[in-house]
Amino acid sequence: IWELKKDVYVVELDWYPDAPGEMVVLTCDTPEEDGITWTLDQSSEVLGSGKTLTIQVKEFGDAGQYTCHKGGEVLSHSLLLLHKKEDGIWSTDILKDQKEPKNKTFLRCEAKNYSGRFTCWWLTTISTDLTFSVKSSRGSSDPQGVTCGAATLSAERVRGDNKEYEYSVECQEDSACPAAEESLPIEVMVDAVHKLKYENYTSSFFIRDIIKPDPPKNLQLKPLKNSRQVEVSWEYPDTWSTPHSYFSLTFCVQVQGKSKREKKDRVFTDKTSATVICRKNASISVRAQDRYYSSSWSEWASVPCS
Amino acid sequence: RAVPGGSSPAWTQCQQLSQKLCTLAWSAHPLVGHMDLREEGDEETTNDVPHIQCGDGCDPQGLRDNSQFCLQRIHQGLIFYEKLLGSDIFTGEPSLLPDSPVGQLHASLLGLSQLLQPEGHHWETQQIPSLSPSQPWQRLLLRFKILRSLQAFVAVAARVFAHGAATLSP
C-alpha cells in the first residue's frame, strides 16, 4: 500500500481467483484513543472499533472510503483504491490502446517545435467517475523539471456503438534548451482513477522524436505565363522554432484530385515555393517536416487549383 | 576551415556535408522509430557518447558570439562517431549488409571532421569508451543505439552549419 495523495491510498493486488489479498492497517488521524468506530462509504454498519482498523483487501467491495467517527463526529477519511496486477502485468482497463506507432501505446505526445512545450493525449470509453493526474520530468534518476497543466476533455467521438473520449494535457519543460541535443528523455506519468480502480501509464520520449510541425501557412498560387504550371508559395508556420536558418524545414508539395487514387504531381523542396502542374478540380497541398531529423510530417495545408 | 586559432570554417561545404550525413544516418537505420531502444538499458552503452549540450555555444546566439566552442564540440563528436563506426561494434559479427550505408557514413564523418580541422592542428578529442559487446545480438543492439544517437548529433551539427552558411559566411 502507498499514498497517492493526502488520505488516498493505493493497494496493489495480485488479481487471480481466490487470491489472498493484502492485509491493510488503517489508522485514524486523531489524538483521540477511545470510542472510535469505523464505517465504509455510505454504510452505517460498524466495521470495527479502535484507533486502527485491520482489513483484508481482496476485491473492489473492500475498497472505498473508510471513515473513523467518535460520537457521531467524523474524525478522518482514508480512501482505498485498488491497482490490479494480472499475470505480473498491471491492468490497463481505463485507457484505450491507440496502437500507434506500436501496440500498448496508451499515451501519445506531440510537440510543434523545440521550445520544450508538448501535448499528450489519451482515449477512454469511460464517461463518469474518472480523474487524471499528470506528472513529467526530464530524466528519471536526477529529474529536471517539467510543468504540466490539468488534463482536460478535449474531444468526444462516436465509434460504432461506443462513445470515445479524448483527454489531453499540455506540459512545458522548465529550462528548455531548443538548440541542444537531448541526452535524457522526457518522462510522462499519468495516474488514472475510475471509481475505485487506480492505474498508471507512462511514456518516455525525446522532444525531437515527437516533433510534428503545424502546416505551412499563407499558401498562394501564381499562374505562369504560357504554361500549365503554377508557382505555389507558402511560409513557415508561426509556431515553428526560430530562426528558420537554424531550425529549417523541408516540404512536400502535391497536386491531387478529391480521390487518393487519382493521378498527382508531387515534388519535394527545401525552399518556400515550388512550381507544379494544376488541374481542374484538384487541390495543391503542402506539408512540412524537420529538414535534418525525420520526425512526423505536418498535416497538409491546401488551396484549390482554380 | 575552423582551426584552433579561430578562423572561419568553410560554412557552405560543411553545410552540404552535414546534410549528407543526416541523409546517410537515416538511410543506415531508417526503421529506428519502430524500436524503443530506451527499454533496453541504454545508460551504460550510449551515455558515454558526446552530446551537444546547452552550454556548448551551438545555439544561434552562441554561434554569433564565438563559433569555436561549438565547432570544437562538433569536431569531438565527429571523431568519436568515426572511431565507433570503424570499431569492432560495426566490423564484427553479424556482418553488415553489403549495401549498408555505414561505410559511406564513416567516410563522410571523417570528411567533415577534416574540413573542420586540417592536418597539423589538434583539438582535444574525447576518449572512445571500450564498448566491446561479446554477443552478436548485443552488438546489433549497440549499433542501433549508436546510429540513433548519431542521427540526433548530426541533426544539430547540420543546423549549426546551415545557420552558419546563411548568417556567418564572409
Epitope: E262, K263, V267, F268, R279 | -
Partner: antibody, heavy 118, light 107 residues
C-alpha cells in the same frame, strides 16, 4: 496488368513528319499521365513531354516546342506523338511511358524505332 | 535546365560484388531523383523513386540514397541479370532530365 503497346518501326526522309501511336490497356486510360521519351542509338534518354489524357493538357520540353504534338483518343485508349520537320539526328527509339505520378515513369512501351535518312 | 551527371560511365564488377553508382545534379533537387535500369533492346524499368523509395517487385539488393545534389544507387550483390545500363532522372523541375547513364559490365 498495365501495358503500353506501340506502333511499328518507321523510316522517314528529312523534313517529313512521323506519328507514333501507343495503345494502353489494363487500366483506365485517363487515370495516368502519358510521356514520350526518346533514345538515340547508343545514347541516353531524353524527355520530350507529357499529356494528360483526361483533358488534353500538354507540356513539352523546350527543345521540341513547336515541332511536336501529343494527342490522345480516349475512345481507343491510344496516345499519339507527332514530330515534324524531321532531321537525321531525330533517329531514335521513341518510348511512351505512363504513371499516376506526373514526374517519373512507372510503365513503359516497348519502343518504336524511327529512322530519318535521305 | 538541370544537368544530371552520372559516374563512372562504365563500371566493371564481378558477380556477387557490390556496385555503387553516382549521380550528381547541377543544382539542389532535394530528393526528386529516380533510378531506372535498361537492358539491351528493352525499355527502361523503374527501380527507385524519390531517391530511396523502393518499388514492389524490385529485388531488395537495389537501394538508393542521397539528397540535394549527390545521389547513390547501390546494388549490394550483383546477379547476372543486373548487368545493364542505369539512368538517374530528376523531377525537381521541367524539363525532366536524365543522366548519361552508367553501364555495369561483367569484370
Amino acid at each position: 496488368q498495365v501495358q503500353l503497346v506501340q506502333s511499328g518501326a518507321e523510316v522517314k526522309k528529312p523534313g517529313a513528319s512521323v506519328k507514333v501511336s501507343c495503345k494502353a490497356s489494363g487500366y483506365t486510360f485517363t487515370d495516368y499521365y502519358l510521356h514520350w521519351v526518346r533514345q538515340a542509338p547508343g545514347r541516353g534518354l531524353e524527355w520530350m513531354g507529357w499529356i494528360d489524357p483526361e483533358n488534353g493538357d500538354t507540356e513539352y520540353a523546350p527543345k521540341f516546342q513547336g515541332r511536336v504534338t501529343m494527342t490522345t483518343d480516349t475512345s481507343t485508349s491510344t496516345a499519339y506523338m507527332e514530330l515534324r520537320s524531321l532531321r537525321s539526328d531525330d533517329t531514335a527509339v521513341y518510348y511512351c511511358a505512363a504513371n499516376k505520378e506526373l514526374r517519373y515513369f512507372d510503365v513503359w512501351g516497348q519502343g518504336t524505332m524511327v529512322t530519318v535518312s535521305s | 535546365e538541370i544537368v544530371m551527371t552520372q559516374s563512372p560511365a562504365t563500371l566493371s564488377v564481378s558477380p556477387g560484388e557490390r556496385a555503387t553508382l553516382s549521380c550528381r545534379a547541377s543544382q539542389s533537387i532535394s530528393i526528386n531523383l529516380h533510378w531506372y535500369q535498361q537492358k539491351p533492346g528493352q525499355a527502361p524499368r523503374l527501380l527507385i523513386y524519390f531517391a530511396s523509395q523502393s518499388i514492389s517487385g524490385i529485388p531488395a539488393r537495389f537501394s538508393g540514397s542521397g539528397s540535394g545534389t549527390e545521389f547513390t544507387l547501390t546494388i549490394s550483390s550483383l546477379q547476372s541479370e543486373d548487368f545493364a545500363v542505369y539512368y538517374c532522372q530528376q523531377s525537381n523541375s521541367f524539363p525532366l532530365t536524365f543522366g548519361g547513364g552508367t553501364k555495369v559490365e561483367i569484370k
